[in-house]
């Protein structure tokens, strides 16, 4: 028979013959012949491959550096690599999770929208006509000012986006 | 065709070195591991070590130190340090890792003072 | 350093009979089932038979049948003929820094 040119899904063609590749797991040790299929080894510990392969060496897990600010979220397997996440309070700086920065903190006169995770920063927001935030926080909310009216007050201040209004007593008529 | 020939076989005397070369043709060394193999005259197969696809080499514990395996792009070479009489035997080459499916027809050492 | 021990030898059969030759590991083979079984006849290389303990090489007449799993492996050669005649080898793949090794070889003789 002809030898093929191209071979199946899951193959490679090498001398004139289509070999398996390895399973994801597994690296190739020797190529198959006309006698046997092809050869392959699982991964060493901490080592893995995710694709149907012919490499010939396994690649590392990613390692989580605590000195990055880095913790294991997901352990690595013969067919996956490590997933690394940020420790509280911070997150990656990009989506390949190599390295942490501390979660942003929302300056007076602005409000938490979305709180960080390990993966994305804190989203900011100006706090609007009626709100406030004194204080810089990655956690804390524009809080709407305080309602003199439902407290029998009346505003002897008014309100800002870094500062709450001031209630006072209304002023009694005289006769 | 995928094929294998042992050469450098011959008589020596204690203690002289000895290259064994493995000559291969129809594959490739640098995806293929290739292990040596040796049978003295009535005796059983017996493994000495082999040659990864990187160029790392593995032996048995009772060959290590003796004999040193190398390869170049379509040889595999057994080298053996210091014969002695017991190293007395036909030097066989095969292809693969843990599988070897393809053997040469084997060279034959003679240590003899 | 691992041990293979094969059982019986010699050992002798008739024509159309059925030989079974056991091969024990002192310690568990690579993934488990890193054994292959090869045939020698005088004067010849060995010829791969079955490997990864049970998987017909290609060529092989399928009254050659390996078994087993771990240390302990087997290997049946039913309906035997004249040509079976030869020395049966078993021979395992280790992790890697222990290698390979060989059980010392079976002779069978067909009567």
């Known amino acids: 028979p002809e030898p093929p040119t191209a071979c199946r899904e899951k193959q490679y063609l090498i001398n004139s013959q289509c070999c398996s590749l390895c399973q994801p797991g597994q690296k190739l040790v020797s190529d198959c012949t006309e006698f046997t299929e092809t050869e392959c080894l699982p991964c060493g510990e901490s080592e893995f491959l995710d694709t149907w392969n012919r490499e010939t060496h396994c690649h590392q897990h990613k390692y989580c550096d605590p000195n990055l600010g880095l913790r294991v979220q997901q352990k690595g397997t013969s067919e996956t690599d490590t997933i690394c996440t940020c420790e509280e309070g911070w997150h990656c700086t990009s989506e390949a999770c190599e390295s942490c920065v501390l979660h942003r903190s929302c300056s007076p006169g602005f409000g938490v929208k979305q709180i960080a995770t390990g993966v994305s920063d804190t989203i900011c927001e100006p706090c609007p006509v009626g709100f406030f935030s004194n204080v810089s926080s990655a956690f804390e909310k524009c809080h709407p000012w305080t309602s003199c009216e439902t407290k029998d007050l009346v505003v002897q201040q008014a309100g800002t986006n870094k500062t709450d209004v001031v209630c006072g007593p209304q002023d009694r008529l005289r006769a | 065709c995928q094929s294998l020939e042992e050469s450098g076989g011959r008589l020596v005397t204690p203690g002289t070195p000895l290259t064994l070369t493995c000559t291969v043709s129809?594959?490739?060394?640098?995806?293929?591991?290739m292990n040596w193999v040796r049978q003295a005259p009535g005796k059983g197969l017996e493994w000495i070590g082999y040659i990864t696809i990187s160029g790392s080499a593995g032996y048995a514990s009772w060959a290590k130190g003796r004999f040193t395996i190398s390869k170049t792009s379509t040889t595999v070479d057994l080298k053996i340090s210091s014969p002695t009489t017991e190293d007395t035997a036909t030097y066989f080459c095969?292809?693969?890792?843990?599988?070897?499916?393809?053997w040469g027809p084997g060279t034959l050492v003679t240590v003899s003072s | 350093a691992q041990v293979l021990t094969q059982t019986p030898s010699p050992v002798s059969a008739p024509v159309g009979g059925t030989v079974t030759i056991n091969c024990q590991s002192s310690q568990n083979v690579l993934i488990n089932n890193r054994l292959a079984w090869y045939q020698q006849k005088p004067g010849q290389p060995p010829k791969l038979l079955i490997y990864d303990a049970s998987k017909l090489a290609s060529g092989v007449p399928s009254r050659f049948k390996g078994s087993g799993s771990g240390t302990q492996f087997t290997l049946t050669i039913s309906g035997v003929q004249c040509d079976d005649a030869a020395t049966y080898y078993c021979?395992?793949?280790?992790?890697?820094?222990?290698?390979?090794?060989f059980g010392g070889g079976t002779e069978v003789v067909v009567k």
């Open positions: 095969a292809r693969g890792y843990n599988t070897m499916a393809i």
């Open positions: 129809g594959f490739d060394l640098s995806s293929n591991a």
């Open positions: 021979q395992a793949g280790y992790s890697s820094g222990d290698g390979n090794a």
